[in-house]
């Protein structure tokens, strides 16, 4: 999948590790797609290094990336989304390393948003809802979501729930009474498209009611 140019001029350059990783985001800005790449070694001297993608493009042979600090990116409508593209790291006119990648297999969804938790007193449960921009998209519509929650004092004790809808019910009896909880959600492609987890949504914080001593039930907030 990846190859190094054999050229004496590049001897010094080839001592470096030019491994890189990329992710795509489809219809991230209207009908525009984006592709973001970065070197895996943060110490690579990127001064004269550029990225280029060729193949599986509409109307054009190749596209150049723009550089923003250590990140290289393209925003375009010209991804064919069928077959593999060749992504190369270049210095001058020489390719240092290339990878053949199908952009539909490196999709990173946009982070969910509008996460909220509503307590239902009568049902003794919490209804968790959130939104995703992918409901409106033509391509990456089907996602798996990972809802993670923890008691605020338990730094690393996250409970995870996977679901395909944007609504989840948490039973009150499964949570500690009179406790502050943090909850967040992320998404990953789940049908045809493959790739990576999105960034986490902003966290939402909620408090569970106290237990009502006479009935053994929690008091509403």
């Amino acid at each position: 999948e990846s190859g190094y140019a054999q050229n004496g001029d590049l001897e010094d350059a080839e001592l470096d590790d030019y491994s890189f990783s990329c992710y795509s985001q489809l219809e991230v800005n209207g009908s525009q797609h984006s592709l973001t790449c970065a070197f895996e070694d943060p110490d690579v001297n990127i001064t004269n290094l550029e990225f280029e993608i060729c193949g599986a493009l509409v109307e054009v042979k190749c596209l150049n990336f723009r550089k923003l600090q250590e990140i290289y990116f393209i925003e375009t409508k010209k991804f064919l989304l069928i077959g593999k593209s060749n992504i190369c790291v270049k210095v001058g006119e020489k390719s240092l390393t290339c990878k053949k990648i199908d952009l539909t297999t490196i999709v990173k969804p946009e982070a969910p948003f509008d996460l909220s938790v509503v307590y239902r007193e009568g049902a003794n449960d919490f209804v968790v809802t959130f939104n995703t921009s992918h409901l409106q998209k033509k391509y990456v519509k089907v996602l798996m979501h990972d809802v993670a929650y923890r008691q605020e004092k338990d730094e690393n004790k996250w409970t995870h729930v996977n679901l395909s809808s944007t609504k989840l019910t948490l039973l009150q009896r499964k949570l500690q009474p009179a406790a502050m909880y943090e909850i967040k959600v992320r998404s990953i492609p789940d049908h045809y498209f493959k790739g990576f987890w999105s960034e986490w949504s902003p966290s939402y914080y909620f408090r569970t009611p106290e237990i009502n001593n006479s009935s053994g039930e929690m008091d509403p907030i």
Partner: antibody
């Protein structure tokens, strides 16, 4: 085959508004690309003025930002340039062209139309 | 704004000569550079894009090289139809800017 054709008055009075239209054939201005205006004063070099993107958003060169408007009529597959408060310095050949943004070129150009600013 | 300094501003050459025009960007622009040819009374014509790639239908005697800040357009063997003005242009950042042009005249 993509073709672009500029049209509009060849003479504009100082302080008035210059209006030009670019008619595109062989490609829809709503499909992709940026649709640009470039001008060239007599005997001088080229100056990029701005574009309207296929999505309808616009970007202008800062030196003209207060005077320039680029719009489009999708039903006629046209995009237009308006330049207000013109002076003799705006006398130039005006070109429309396709490209830029995610590609590093203007691949199709109109033949150009000469606009003279004079009373 | 990124300044594009083109040199020379004019040159005289004969048919068959090798001609080199340079374009120096005031800051690094990667491969975001194009070269155009313009003949009197005509619109510019794309020759080279992405600094080194030959546009469709352009003769192979034209070539582009460079990346970053220093770019070169070379005509390996000048033909009678190549006498024209040549411009470089950067697409790296707004406003997109052109070089001042190089007029190639018959010696």
């Amino acid at each position: 085959q993509v073709q672009l054709q500029e049209s509009g008055p060849g003479l504009v009075k100082p302080s008035e508004t210059l209006s030009l239209t670019c008619t595109v054939s062989g490609y829809s201005v709503t499909t992709d690309y940026a649709w640009n205006w470039i001008r060239q004063p007599p005997g001088k070099g080229l100056e990029w003025m701005g574009y309207i993107f296929y999505s309808g958003s616009t970007t202008y060169t800062p030196s003209l930002k207060s005077r320039i408007t680029i719009s489009r009529d999708t039903s006629k597959n046209q995009f237009s340039l308006k330049l207000s408060s013109v002076t003799a310095a705006d006398t130039a050949v005006y070109y429309c062209a396709r490209g830029g943004y995610d590609v590093n070129y203007f691949d199709y150009w109109g033949q150009g139309t000469t606009v003279t600013v004079s009373s | 704004d990124i300044q594009m300094l083109q040199s020379p501003s004019s040159l005289s050459a004969s048919v068959g000569d090798r001609v080199t025009i340079t374009c120096l960007a005031s800051q690094t622009i990667g491969y975001w550079l194009a070269w155009y040819q313009q003949k009197p009374g005509k619109a510019p014509k794309l020759l080279i894009y992405a600094a080194t790639r030959l546009a469709d239908g352009v003769p192979s005697r034209f070539s582009g090289s460079g990346s970053g800040t220093m770019f070169t357009l070379t005509i390996s063997s000048l033909q009678p139809e190549d006498f024209a003005t040549y411009y470089c242009q950067q697409f790296f950042s707004y406003p997109w800017t052109f070089g001042g042009g190089t007029k190639v005249e018959i010696k």
